[in-house]
Amino acid sequence: SGTTNTVAAYNLTWKSTNFKTILEWEPKPVNQVYTVQISTKSGDWKSKCFYTTDTECDLTDEIVKDVKQTYLARVFSYPAGNVESTGSAGEPLYENSPEFTPYLETNLGQPTIQSFEQVGTKVNVTVEDERTLVRRNNTFLSLRDVFGKDLIYTLYYWKSSSSGKKTAKTNTNEFLIDVDKGENYCFSVQAVIPSRTVNRKSTDSPVECMGQEKGEFREI
């Protein structure tokens, strides 16, 4: 049910990366506005993005309260300029989103190689521990803080002069790898949550190569 001049939202889709979480939907409004509500399975509905003409709503502030909870959102449609109007059943028209569990479903953002340091035939490659919008005790948590040992990184590395690649894994944000003396290497990393069944891997980081400014070389 609903008013005669409103249409229900459809294609409700969660877009989430490193817990920055936006609900998107269609259609672009014509003579109508939207309000979004979000709730955990057992909680109360909270309204967000009141009477908006946008077709997206940033729900990050709500889901970061507990990223392991499962959330449901719904989008209400109202006639523009008459938001008190309801449908014949006494309720505005609305559509439910799919369920969303941030810890299990947020996409892993593209990682960044923070630095690499060569000492003799060893190279230490450090991955930037990206800050998320998840808070604990008024401080923002990093990706590692949130996921702990559930998060691993895969490193791909190769000699600049050849195509043969090697790989390594770490459950910290650092790799210590063996390299051939006098050779320059290139590096790329990928974040992985092996326990997941979807959204398991990030895209690869930008490639960083030795001999460029990001690294440091020390002969010992």
Epitope: T167, A168, T170, Q190, P194, S195, R200, K201
Partner: antibody, heavy 117, light 107 residues
Framework: QVQLLESGAVLARPGTSVKISCKAS????????MHWVRQAPGQGLEWIGG????????MYDPKFQGRVTITADESTSTAYMELSSLRSEDSAVYFC??????????WGQGTLVTVSS | DIQMTQSPSSLSASVGDRVTITCKAS??????LSWYQQKPGKAPKLLIY???SLADGVPSRFSGSGSGTDYTLTISSLQPEDFATYYC?????????FGGGTKVEIK
């Protein structure tokens, strides 16, 4: 459910090449890594190499470098392993396996490759 | 390359025995170690992943322990279906390497 179905047994001449396929079902191969392992008669397991179907990166044991090519076709959910310049000591059962990041958790049934003149 | 030294290479045991198999890596592999059971003519079957986690459907008599360079697979009470060959695998860095295998036979 997750399954890896390998192509059938192969008899090959020394010096030729063999290409084995591994058809995945029950998961999206680009979300995982795909590896190849072989086992000669009465011997242990030997890693040949692996591939990340999401970005095309392939890694090989240096022992096979230059002789092996591991690829994946996301559109058909199939991983491939091609081994060239075959010799008699390449006679073995070849397994494909899915790597979750924590382990090789699912394996194909194995493909017997016999190299003989 | 990381070497994996698995011991013993074979052992004889009776049903109900406690069996321990060890793998030692030549360098720290950060728990990227898994254990497999293989029976003749079959593909390996995952038992333990990430050094200590029991794979789905694997009986609780199997357990894994260890960190750094030293890892152990324990079968608390050997059952008739456990007579097989067991392998460890390090996948912390390429080339990935298997242990040489442990054949568990009936005494």
């Amino acid at each position: 459910q997750v399954q890896l179905l390998e192509s059938g047994a192969v008899l090959a001449r020394p010096g030729t090449s063999v290409k084995i396929s591994c058809k995945a079902s029950g998961f999206n191969i680009k979300d995982y890594y795909m590896h190849w392992v072989r086992q000669a008669p009465g011997q242990g397991l030997e890693w040949i190499g692996g591939n990340d179907p999401a970005n095309g990166h392939s890694m090989y044991d240096p022992k096979f470098q230059g002789r092996v090519t591991i690829t994946a076709d996301e559109s058909t959910s199939t991983a491939y392993m091609e081994l060239s310049s075959l010799r008699s000591e390449d006679s073995a059962v070849y397994f494909c396996a899915r790597d979750s990041g924590y382990a090789m958790d699912y394996w194909g049934q194995g493909t017997l490759v016999t190299v003989s003149s | 390359d990381i070497q994996m030294t698995q011991s013993p290479s074979s052992l004889s045991a009776s049903v109900g025995d406690r069996v321990t198999i060890t793998c030692k890596a030549s360098q720290d592999i950060k728990s990227f170690l898994s254990w497999y059971q293989q029976k003749p003519g079959k593909a390996p079957k995952l038992l333990i992943y990430y050094a200590t986690s029991l794979a789905d459907g694997v009986p609780s008599r199997f357990s894994g322990s260890g960190s750094g360079t030293d890892y152990t697979l324990t079968i608390s009470s050997l059952q008739p279906e456990d007579f097989a060959t067991y392998y460890c695998l390090q996948h912390g860095e390429s080339p990935y390497t298997f242990g040489g295998g442990t054949k568990v036979e009936i005494k």
